[in-house]
Interface confidence: low
């Protein structure tokens, strides 16, 4: 409790005491009768009047003083209240600012944690990629140091799958040019020998016309690596191959390609489609993975 508030309570008590004094009980009756007889009565009356006057003056003076004190206290209290309200408002504002700052700090911390997590993930990916590249490069080095007859790993940027390496073009060439490109890479246009391989290639090329290593430019359908066509896997579209001549480009359709749904179609070999190169890994066992 503040000192001003204690004083205020004391003032109230004092006021109460003075009220009780003004309303005091009358003197006993037999004594009054005794005093009211003769000159003593006058003297007593004067004395009492004088006493009463003194009392009144004292009380008036004290009351005036008390009123002044009360006014001062009220003013002080009013100022204190205003000051307190201002301080409370100030504290409230500061509290709001602190809250906002806290939220901002929390948000920043959260973002930094997220950034750190992303950096960590990115770093892990880079490390994995680095290890993969390192393994690939060490394998390339081994291949270069060897007599070149054995390939135990895929070239850089080629995808390994089931003991074969695949390279997926992003540009288009005529079938013969695509075939030549693969040969220059010591590979051949992709030869599809199973449903599983079909699905793998299809996943990587997407819904895009893409040449494969199958043609019938010499009559029978023929895989470029010598795999027997007649006994092998086939995935033609219905009614294909049809060796269609209606395209008006001269000649029939002698080269096979993956269509947008993965099934095969025969088409004019001059069309500039994307292509897939394939090369087989040697049977020699691979090095154990570094990770």
């Amino acid at each position: 409790m503040t000192k001003e508030y204690q004083d205020l309570q004391h003032l109230d008590n004092e006021e109460s005491d003075h009220h009780q004094l003004r309303k005091g009980p009358p003197p006993p009756q037999p004594l009054l009768q005794r005093l009211c007889s003769g000159p003593r009565l006058l003297l007593l009356s004067l004395g009492l009047s004088l006493l009463l006057l003194v009392v009144v003056c004292v009380i008036g003076s004290q009351n005036s003083q008390l009123q002044e004190e009360l006014r001062g206290l009220r003013e002080t209290f009013s100022n204190f209240t205003a000051s307190t309200e201002a301080q409370v408002k100030g504290l409230s504002t500061q509290g709001g600012n602190v809250g906002r700052k806290m939220k901002s700090l929390e948000s920043q911390l959260e973002k930094q944690q997220k950034d750190l997590s992303e950096d960590h993930s990115s770093l892990l990916l880079h490390v994995k990629q680095f290890v993969s590249d390192l393994r690939s490069l060490s394998c390339q080095m081994a291949a270069l140091q060897g007599n070149g007859s054995e390939r135990t790993c895929c070239p850089v940027n080629w995808v390994e799958h089931e003991r074969s390496c695949y390279w997926f073009s992003r540009s288009g060439k005529a079938w013969a040019d695509a075939d030549n490109y693969c040969r220059l890479e010591d590979a051949h246009l992709v030869v599809v020998t199973s449903w599983e391989e079909q699905k793998f290639v299809q996943h990587h090329i997407g819904p895009v016309n893409t040449w494969m290593g199958l043609h019938d430019q010499n009559g029978p359908w023929k895989w470029v690596d010598g795999t027997d066509y007649e006994t092998g896997f086939k995935n033609w579209r219905p009614e294909q191959p049809d060796d269609w001549y209606g395209h008006g480009l001269g000649g029939g359709e002698d080269c096979a390609h993956f269509t947008d749904d993965g099934r095969w179609n025969d088409d004019v070999c001059q069309r500039p489609y994307r292509w897939v190169c394939e090369t087989e890994l040697d049977k020699a066992s691979q090095e154990p993975p570094l990770l």
Epitope: D216, Q217, N218, G219, P220, W221, K222, G226, D228, Y229, E230, T231, G232, P241, D242, D243, Y245, G250, G251, G252, E253, D254, D266
Partner: antibody
Framework: QVQLVESGGGVVQPGRSLRLSCAAS????????MHWVRQAPGKGLEWVAV????????YYADSVKGRFTIARDNSKNTLYLQMNSLRAEDTAVYYC???????????WGQGTLVTVSS | SYELTQPLSVSVALGQTARITCGGN??????VHWYQQKPGQAPILVIY???DRPSGIPERFSGSNSGNTATLTISRAQAGDEADYFC?????????FGGGTKLTVL
């Protein structure tokens, strides 16, 4: 209509040469692979050779490899079979046939008889 | 090299169904073509890719292929169907013919 007509057959001595021709009409000759198939008297059919539509690739049966040469002249719509070092076992009717993709041989010419005899 | 085996001859009563077989190792995995050759004439394609018929060939001619045997079926056989029949497949870049079957319509 599609038509194939062979010519150039005849009697020839062993070790000598002969050139067969096959004139094509009724279709775009330069768009099709072409074959030679032979049939010895009273025997079955034997495939001899194939040439791609543009002449860029040729394949032969083992029995004639190194002795026979398949060729074509697309400007003349004509298929050829140059036969060298002929043997008695080469005696047969020689047919030329068109190959429309993976549909078998269709059609065939009427054939020309080659007889290798001394 | 790949070999195709055909029966030398098959007989069928007029109007009945004739079946000519062509045997080969896993032939069901290959496309089989059938040719008809009448005496003194060039062969003509009657069935290609196991079961397809070229235009102009009657519906009476049908084909099937599975396992180690391909079959040419001629229903309601007619006298005009009497001929030699050859099956054919591709083995790498080489065409291989069966020995041929002589169909006799009784």
């Amino acid at each position: 209509q599609v038509q194939l007509v062979e010519s150039g057959g005849g009697v020839v001595q062993p070790g000598r040469s002969l050139r067969l021709s096959c004139a094509a009409s009724g279709f775009t000759f330069s768009s099709y692979a072409m074959h030679w198939v032979r049939q010895a008297p009273g025997k079955g059919l034997e495939w001899v050779a194939v040439i791609w539509y543009d002449g860029s690739n040729k394949y032969y049966a083992d029995s004639v490899k190194g002795r026979f040469t398949i060729a074509r002249d697309n400007s003349k719509n004509t298929l050829y079979l140059q036969m060298n070092s002929l043997r008695a076992e080469d005696t047969a009717v020689y047919y030329c046939a068109r190959d429309p993709g993976s549909y078998g041989f269709d059609p065939w010419g009427q054939g020309t008889l080659v007889t290798v005899s001394s | 090299s790949y070999e195709l085996t055909q029966p030398l001859s098959v007989s069928v009563a007029l109007g009945q169904t004739a079946r000519i077989t062509c045997g080969g190792n896993n032939i069901g995995r290959r496309n089989v073509h059938w040719y008809q050759q009448k005496p003194g004439q060039a062969p003509i394609l009657v069935i290609y890719r196991d079961r397809d018929r070229p235009s102009g060939i009657p519906e009476r001619f049908s084909g099937s292929n599975s396992g180690n045997t391909a079959t040419l079926t001629i229903s309601r056989a007619q006298a005009g169907d009497e001929a030699d029949y050859f099956c054919q497949v591709w083995d790498s870049s080489t065409a291989v013919f069966g020995g041929g079957t002589k169909l006799t319509v009784l």
